[in-house]
Each structure stands twice: as structure tokens, then as C-alpha cells.
Interface confidence: low
């Protein structure tokens, strides 16, 4: 187990022409926050696929108001690191998505509005326990600078967080064949070669494949407690035979999972499913608070200011789940009447009505063209007591006042899939391509806008890509 840590250094206009407009204004002050999504391996999955290694949301940054006439500066950032805990081994190779979100603080009905400002993605090699690697990524006219590392949580050590350290049994040296655990020199590296299933609490090994029991435990996997009360000839602590044994409890007996976690047996031992706010092998670690950014997709975290109180995620429209991690398909409720086409734009539902119908849900039957005007060069077409506008290219809607589907122009290059989004569109790139419009080919060696660090990790230097 361990933690992936991301430090955002700056987010602002990239070099070169076409500096982006500031995302905030005097009329609409806003603040930024970031979301990181991690996936194992050098995956080429779409942005919508699950963050199998984990995800995290930053705190909100300071409120920012654009100075009139001034170019967009580097924007004020949230304090602190984004931390993504991982339970299992660190995979060594991973893919990341870092999203920069804007929270508008104007007089929105129903609270703040969230919109995605930029999304960068990449694929990297990274050894746990190594130094901070630095990176620069561009998304359109924006540039994001950040550092990242993976570190193991004790007792795990090593480049994959798979070696374990244990306190020394003797003050002077480690057991046979075991090394001191750098950098914890007062601890010893625990062997990884015991028999599969050997109890980590009550068993140990000095040779590969064996499972020797600590005093008071027995059985092939040292999971059976020794009963001494009715013993005539008690056997030594390493005995795997019967003699003075009582049937041992199953791994879930007595429920080893703390804090209301539920226990399920596994081939090796047990697994705890933890309630919200707790994690760890036995759900013993509390302390997931709003500061940890547990709410995804712009969810607003409430409560949970201290580790003992639970947090609640208030999800923006279109998302649900205890961490706002699930997208709601609100169109499945068929809210658009009269054959209207339903569009879920994230922050709202939009119905695109058939000719002759109008209204938020296409509930109104329309008159003919009398007194009707079609905007943006559209022409009114009568028929059957209804009117419709035949709109010029690039416009749509009842009166041609709406811009057409942003994906209609096929803006995603190289076979990327386009998704209509409430801030415009998002491209999910085909394997081998990346960028806001999938315009950049990924380098053949698996690098994206910057090269992946080779095995052994190097601090890939971004300067040469400026």
C-alpha cells in the first residue's frame, strides 16, 4: 500500500500566441480545483473509463477575479498535495488524467456552477520511493506544471511497495537472511517467500515456501491457536501436527474489520469492505475528510472537518453515488415529450424538439409561421398547423438560436470520440493519440507530450519542450 502524490505548481496560459481568456471575470469570480485520475499500466483507455488506481480531488483554490484588460496570469492554486492512496502494489507504469475545473461563484440559481477548463493526460513509468518527477503538459492554450511521486506506507517498502518491514526481534541484528530495511535501519525486511497463505501475524519463514508458527499458533498456515488447557504433551510452537489443538476460528470469526466494515473470506485470509470514511486492511484507518477531496466530478463536500465525522458529497446534476463517482443517465427517464431528443449536458438536461413543438420538455405545440422569426439566417417552413425553422449551417433549435451540436463537425482528430459537454466538447482519443482534439500522436516509446521516464526513474526534464 502507498500514496501517489501530485503537487500542482502552476496553471496558466501556455507560451506562444493565442493566450486564453481568463476563466474568471469581475461579473463571474471563480476559483480552480483539480482532479487526478490514475489507471495502472500504459493504458489507452478513454477518459471515461474507471480510475482503477484511484482518484482525488483538490481543495478549492482562492477566489480569483480578472483584472479588466489584463492578460490571464497564472491562476491562484489550491493549497496542498493531491493524494491518491493505493491499497495494493504500485504498478510501476501508470496513466494519469489531470483535470482543471472552474467553480463559478456568481449568482447561479442552485449554487455554484462547475465547468471543465482543461484536461491533460499522459503515461509514465515511476518507481515508488523515488524522488519527485516534474512535468509540463499543455491543453489547448493552457499549460499545467506539476510534480508527482509514489511513496509506500509503512510497513511496505520497495519500488512496488511489496516488500514489508517489521520491527526487529533482536536489538542487534535481523534474522537469518534478512536485511535492515532502508531507510528504517531499526527495522528488518520481512521475507516475501513464505508459503502462500502463511498468517502474516502468527507465521514467519526462514526458507522459501515454509511457514513456521509463533508461540501459541499452529497449523500449516499458523492460523490455528494452540490450546494448552487439556494438553498432556504440548508440542513446540512450530508444530504443524495435532496434539493439543482445538479447531481454529475462520478468518472472519469475530469480525476483524473495525468501524463497521464487513468481512469476507479469501483464499489467503480475509478482506474488509470498509464504510465511507475508513480504509486500511481492517478499516482501522479513519480520517477521510473533506480536505482529502473525496467527492468527484465537482461534488461539494460537506462536514467531515475532523476524521471522526463523516463527510457527505453533494453531487452536481448528472452525478450520484457516495462520492459522486457515478454518472446518472437522466435521459433514460424519457423526459422529452412529443418525440424530442434528450441531451444530458451534465449541468442540465436539454430537449431538442421535433418540428412543431417547443418548450423545455417539448410540451408546447407551435403555431404556423405567422409572426415567427427564425434567427441566424434560418427560414420558416409551414406545415400541418405547426412551424419549424430550417436553420443555416451551424445553428439549430426551434428558432435557430442554438448553436448546433459541437460534435457535429467531427472535431476530434485521428478517430477520437466526441462527447458533448456543458463547457463545449471533450475528445476521448483513440490509442496512440492525445491532446484536447487528439491532435498529438503519442511517441512510439510510450511517451506523450513528454517522454516517459525509463526504468529506474529519471527526472524527465520539461524545459526542452518549452
Amino acid at each position: 500500500a502507498g500514496v501517489f502524490e501530485l503537487q500542482i505548481h502552476s496553471f496558466g496560459p501556455g507560451p506562444g500566441p493565442g493566450a486564453p481568456r481568463s476563466p474568471c471575470s469581475a461579473r463571474l469570480p471563480c476559483r480552480l480545483f483539480f482532479r487526478v485520475c490514475l489507471k495502472p499500466g500504459l493504458s489507452e483507455e478513454a477518459a471515461e473509463s474507471p480510475c482503477a488506481l484511484g482518484a482525488a480531488l483538490s481543495a478549492r483554490g482562492p477566489v480569483y477575479t480578472e483584472q479588466p484588460g489584463a492578460p490571464a496570469p497564472d491562476l491562484p492554486l489550491p493549497d496542498g498535495l493531491l493524494q491518491v492512496p493505493f491499497r495494493d502494489a504500485w504498478p510501476g507504469t501508470f496513466s494519469f488524467i489531470i483535470e482543471t475545473w472552474r467553480e463559478e461563484l456568481g449568482d447561479q440559481i442552485g449554487g455554484p456552477a462547475w465547468s471543465l477548463l482543461a484536461r491533460v493526460a499522459g503515461r509514465r513509468r515511476l518507481a515508488a520511493g523515488g524522488p519527485w518527477a516534474r512535468d509540463i503538459q499543455r491543453a489547448g492554450a493552457w499549460e499545467l506544471r506539476f510534480s508527482y511521486r509514489a511513496r509506500c506506507e509503512p510497513p511496505a517498502v520497495g519500488t512496488a511497495c511489496t516488500r514489508l518491514c517489521r520491527p526487529r526481534s533482536a536489538p542487534s541484528r535481523c534474522g537469518p537472511g534478512l536485511r535492515p530495511c532502508a531507510p528504517l535501519e531499526d527495522e528488518c525486511e520481512a521475507p516475501l517467500v513464505c508459503r502462500a497463505g502463511c498468517s502474516p501475524e502468527h507465521g514467519f519463514c526462514e526458507q522459501p515456501g515454509e511457514c513456521r508458527c509463533l508461540e501459541g499458533w499452529t497449523g500449516p498456515l499458523c492460523t490455528v491457536p494452540v490450546s494448552t488447557s487439556s494438553c498432556l504433551s504440548p508440542r513446540g510452537p512450530s508444530s504443524a501436527t495435532t496434539g493439543c489443538l482445538v479447531p481454529g476460528p475462520g478468518p472472519c470469526d469475530g469480525n476483524p474489520c473495525a468501524n463497521g466494515g464487513s468481512c469476507s473470506e479469501t483464499p489467503r485470509s480475509f478482506e474488509c469492505t470498509c464504510p465511507r470514511g475508513f480504509y486500511g486492511l481492517r478499516c482501522e484507518v479513519s480520517g477521510v475528510t473533506c480536505a482529502d477531496g473525496p467527492c468527484f466530478n465537482g461534488g461539494l463536500c460537506v462536514g467531515g472537518a475532523d476524521p471522526d465525522s463523516a463527510y457527505i458529497c453533494h453531487c452536481p446534476p448528472g452525478f450520484q453515488g457516495s462520492n459522486c463517482e457515478k454518472r446518472v443517465d437522466r435521459c433514460s427517464l424519457q423526459p422529452c415529450r412529443n418525440g424530442g431528443l434528450c441531451l444530458d449536458l451534465g449541468h442540465a438536461l436539454r430537449c431538442r424538439c421535433r418540428a412543431g413543438f417547443a418548450g423545455p420538455r417539448c410540451e408546447h405545440d407551435l403555431d404556423d409561421c405567422a409572426g415567427r422569426a427564425c434567427a441566424n439566417g434560418g427560414t420558416c417552413v409551414e406545415g400541418g398547423g405547426a412551424h419549424r425553422c430550417s436553420c443555416a449551417l451551424g445553428f439549430g433549435g426551434r428558432d435557430c438560436r442554438e448553436r448546433a451540436d459541437p460534435c457535429a463537425a467531427r472535431p476530434c482528430a485521428h478517430g477520437g470520440r466526441c462527447y458533448a459537454h456543458f463547457s463545449g466538447l471533450v475528445c476521448a482519443c483513440a490509442p496512440g493519440y492525445m491532446g484536447a482534439r487528439c491532435e498529438f500522436p503519442v511517441h512510439p516509446d510510450g511517451a506523450s507530450a513528454l517522454p516517459a521516464a525509463p526504468p529506474g526513474l529519471r527526472p524527465g526534464d520539461p524545459q526542452r519542450y518549452l
Partner: antibody
Framework: QVQLVQSGAEVKKPGASVKVSCKAS????????ITWVRQAPGQGLEWMGD?????????NYNEKFKSRVTMTRDTSTSTVYMELSSLRSEDTAVYYC??????????????WGQGTLVTVSS | EIVLTQSPATLSLSPGERATLSCRAS??????LHWYQQKPGQAPRLLIK???QSISGIPARFSGSGSGTDFTLTISSLEPEDFAVYYC?????????FGGGTKLEIK
């Protein structure tokens, strides 16, 4: 203009610790990595580690010094500190702080402090 | 760690001459190499970053070249103030390392 001003010379006994300061001015302190480099008398340059002042826990240390060096920062005074413990005579050197060239990235060092001579002698 | 070997250790030239300093890495460091100048009693000064990128305020007579493992710093026409020690530095892998230096002295 960018300036890095270091604390004065120190004389320490073996086994003691020394804490050298580096006060930055003329730029946004929290945005640039600060590196520490040392130079023993008549010798070359040796990289000790670096710190990102925007987050005090964001540090990289040379494995050679990892168990003895600690880098910290105080954003209220725009000062970075390098503490070296368990001093030995071979730690006698001039210790430099230096700022790296670009915000959040790059490893070349374009602005340097004047250096602090640390002498370890019994 | 990556070892940087600078040669020659000492180079004796006269003002107006061309100086060529070499830095060889024990393994490929791509273009993650920088050059510094250091005068007695002073801190080092960055001359060239990323093999060949110039630094503002550094005279145009300083230039860099090379790739992979072999790199060169060239001073096209030596001025009296150029006599100093020159170090290369790699930032391709941890720990960051410096070369042993080349002392450029007046002949």
C-alpha cells in the same frame, strides 16, 4: 532583481548539526525549486537535494545525505533552510543554495547564493 | 549514478584563442546537460542549459553542443575574464551530478 542571501559562516564540532538559511527575494518564492549544492575545499560541486517551497514536504534528497539532511522552508519570510546532522570533518565545505530556472520544472540553476562556509573541527 | 568526466582537467590558452571543453557521461543523458563557470571565491554561474540553450546575460562567445554521452562547451575567442573553472551538470537521473571540472588558465 532575484537574490538569494545565505547565513554566515559556521564552525561546528563533529557529531553536531548545522542549519544554513537562504533568504529569497525578487521573485515568487513558492513557485521555484531551491537546490542545495556543496563544495569541499579545492573540490568539485556535489548536489545534496532540493525543495519545492510551495509545499514543504516536496523534497528530493541525494541518497548519500538522506539520513542526515533535512530541507525546510518558511513562506512567511521566503527562507529555505538546510540542516545537516551528525557532522564529520569531511562535511567541511561551502554550502550553496540555488534557484532552478523555471516555475515548477527544470533542474538547471540560474541564481545562486553567495555560499556559507561550514567548518567541522574538534 | 551517472559519472561525468571532464577533459582536459586543465587547459592553458591565451586570450583571443578558441577553447573547447569536453564532458563525457557514463551513459546517455539525452540533452539534460548544463554548463557552469566558477571563479575563485564566487558561486557558480549558469552559462548554457540543455546542451545548447543560451542564458540571458551570458556573452554569445559561449556555445554548447553534443548529445547522448558526449558534450562540448566552446568559447570562440577567450577574454581575460573567461579564465575560471568550468563544470558540466547532468539532470537526467538521480542523483544529479556534476563533472570534476576543467580549469581554464592563462598560458
Amino acid at each position: 532583481q532575484v537574490q538569494l542571501v545565505q547565513s554566515g559562516a559556521e564552525v561546528k564540532k563533529p557529531g553536531a548539526s548545522v542549519k544554513v538559511s537562504c533568504k529569497a527575494s525578487g521573485y515568487t518564492f513558492i513557485s521555484y525549486w531551491i537546490t542545495w549544492v556543496r563544495q569541499a575545499p579545492g573540490q568539485g560541486l556535489e548536489w545534496m537535494g532540493d525543495i519545492y517551497p510551495g509545499s514543504g514536504s516536496t523534497t528530493n534528497y541525494n541518497e548519500k545525505f538522506k539520513s542526515r539532511v533535512t530541507m525546510t522552508r518558511d513562506t512567511s519570510t521566503s527562507t529555505v533552510y538546510m540542516e545537516l546532522s551528525s557532522l564529520r570533518s569531511e562535511d567541511t565545505a561551502v554550502y550553496y543554495c540555488a534557484r532552478e530556472t523555471t516555475v515548477g520544472g527544470a533542474y538547471a540553476m540560474d541564481y545562486w547564493g553567495q555560499g556559507t562556509l561550514v567548518t567541522v573541527s574538534s | 549514478e551517472i559519472v561525468l568526466t571532464q577533459s582536459p582537467a586543465t587547459l592553458s590558452l591565451s586570450p583571443g584563442e578558441r577553447a573547447t571543453l569536453s564532458c563525457r557521461a557514463s551513459q546517455s543523458i539525452n540533452n539534460n546537460l548544463h554548463w557552469y563557470q566558477q571563479k575563485p571565491g564566487q558561486a557558480p554561474r549558469l552559462l548554457i542549459k540543455y546542451v545548447s540553450q543560451s542564458i540571458s546575460g551570458i556573452p554569445a562567445r559561449f556555445s554548447g553542443s553534443g548529445s547522448g554521452t558526449d558534450f562540448t562547451l566552446t568559447i570562440s575567442s577567450l577574454e581575460p575574464e573567461d579564465f575560471a573553472v568550468y563544470y558540466c551538470q547532468q539532470t537526467n537521473s538521480w542523483p544529479l551530478t556534476f563533472g570534476g571540472g576543467t580549469k581554464l588558465e592563462i598560458k
